[in-house]
Interface confidence: low
């Protein structure tokens, strides 16, 4: 069916980067400036995405592909195709509705985005804490407590709180 239709449809011959111009007896016209067609046989070209404001251009628009945006420094991409930009926080923090907040004791975040995660509970694996955790780093688990001198202990952090409706924290 596709093959039959394509033989009858002059627009099917129009390659990517062009459109089938009904105003010009269905000839293949190049996409106008700031527009593109990523597939052949299209009757219109799509308007190029413009990376404005907090968005910046990662890849320029061409006649066959849309522009791609990322975020200006201090922000990171969210959503499909970087449809939104969200504020960065520092390591050891997470973004809340009130801005960047330090991770609670027993949790850490080693990135500029995302949420604070609980420290690993070494004792669950029969190990002990070799290096204590910080706001920025998880604990490092070492040998089992039996292999260590008396007094070694594992850290069991409190469960992280949540901000309801938005994000597990």
């Amino acid at each position: 069916f596709e093959r039959t239709r394509s033989l009858q449809d002059p627009c099917s011959n129009c390659p990517a980067g062009t459109f089938c111009d009904n105003n010009r007896n269905q000839i293949c016209s190049p996409c106008p400036p700031n527009s593109f067609s990523s597939a052949g046989g299209q009757r219109t070209c799509d308007i190029c995405r413009q990376c404005k404001g907090v968005f910046r251009t990662r890849k320029e628009c061409s006649s066959t592909s849309n522009a791609e945006c990322d975020c200006t420094p201090g922000f990171h991409c969210l959503g499909a195709g970087c449809s939104m930009c969200e504020q960065d926080c520092k390591q050891g923090q997470e973004l809340t509705k009130k801005g960047c907040k330090d991770c609670c004791f027993g949790t850490f975040n080693d990135q500029k985005r995302g949420i604070c995660r609980p420290w690993t509970n070494c004792s669950l694996d029969g190990k002990s804490v070799l290096v204590n955790g910080t706001k920025e780093r998880d604990v490092v688990c070492g040998p089992s407590p039996a292999d260590l001198s008396p007094g070694a202990s594992s850290v069991t952090p409190p469960a992280p709180a949540r901000e309801p409706g938005h994000s597990p924290q």
Partner: antibody
């Protein structure tokens, strides 16, 4: 590409229950909240609740808390909304929509096509 | 629950005209407000989030403003494709609550 595909229309009797599904594809299911929003014919939008698939944490609108149950099946990337004790005023289109895990500015960036539930005796 | 009072409930405007829709919250919502556009038989589409941030791909003729309890959606020059119903949504507190909607028609 990202898609939320909802189950088909339902006709139910007052007092019965209905369970709607929302199958997600094209993204990491566990990294987004699934919200349920309904719209009665010719009326506005009403948020019913949401669920975080990673650990099934839920928030409910108190208006529906006793009648709505949100669940997920991570193996099939499907979210479910069950509404019990149906009454005629529950006749509405029910939408599922997602919000990003870390995103405090709740942008519902993708929506299902909606499921019409008709409650009639 | 936070109540969102949206006005007007319907609005008739000419093409090219500047259109303004307002939403008033029953308490301060700290700019946690989105605006949606919904066309008949379709799911809503987010236009604005955090009161004034335009979702990428939404035409720049749409803008949002406001703070505290009072918020505004403005269409600087009405186009045929803007004919739809518009809703505001507060998400400062659970449950998120929508305004009653504004049906926009061509004069």
């Amino acid at each position: 590409q990202v898609q939320l595909v909802q189950s088909g229309a339902e006709v139910k009797k007052p007092g019965s229950s209905v369970k709607l599904s929302c199958k997600a594809s094209g993204y990491t299911f566990s990294s987004y909240w699934i919200n349920w929003v309904r719209q009665a014919p010719g009326q506005g939008l009403e948020w019913m609740g949401n669920i975080y698939p990673s650990d099934s944490y839920t928030n409910y609108n108190q208006k529906f808390k006793d009648r709505v149950t949100l669940t997920v099946d991570k193996s099939t990337s499907t979210a479910y909304m069950e509404l019990s004790s149906l009454r005629s005023e529950d006749t509405a289109v029910y939408y599922c929509t997602r919000t990003w895990e870390f995103y405090y500015d709740s942008v519902f960036d993708y929506w299902g096509q909606g499921t019409l539930v008709t409650v009639s005796s | 629950d936070i109540q969102m009072t949206q006005s007007p409930s319907s609005l008739s405007a000419s093409l090219g005209e500047r259109v303004t829709i307002t939403c008033k919250a029953s308490q301060d919502i700290n700019s946690y407000l989105s605006w949606f556009q919904q066309k008949p038989g379709k799911a809503p589409k987010t236009l604005i989030y955090r009161a004034n941030r335009l979702v990428d791909g939404v035409p720049s003729r749409f803008s949002g403003s406001g703070s505290g309890q009072d918020y505004t959606l403005t269409i600087s020059s009405l186009q045929p494709e803007d004919i739809a119903t518009y809703y505001c949504l507060q998400y400062d507190e659970l449950p998120p609550t929508f305004g009653g909607g504004t049906k926009l028609e061509i004069k």
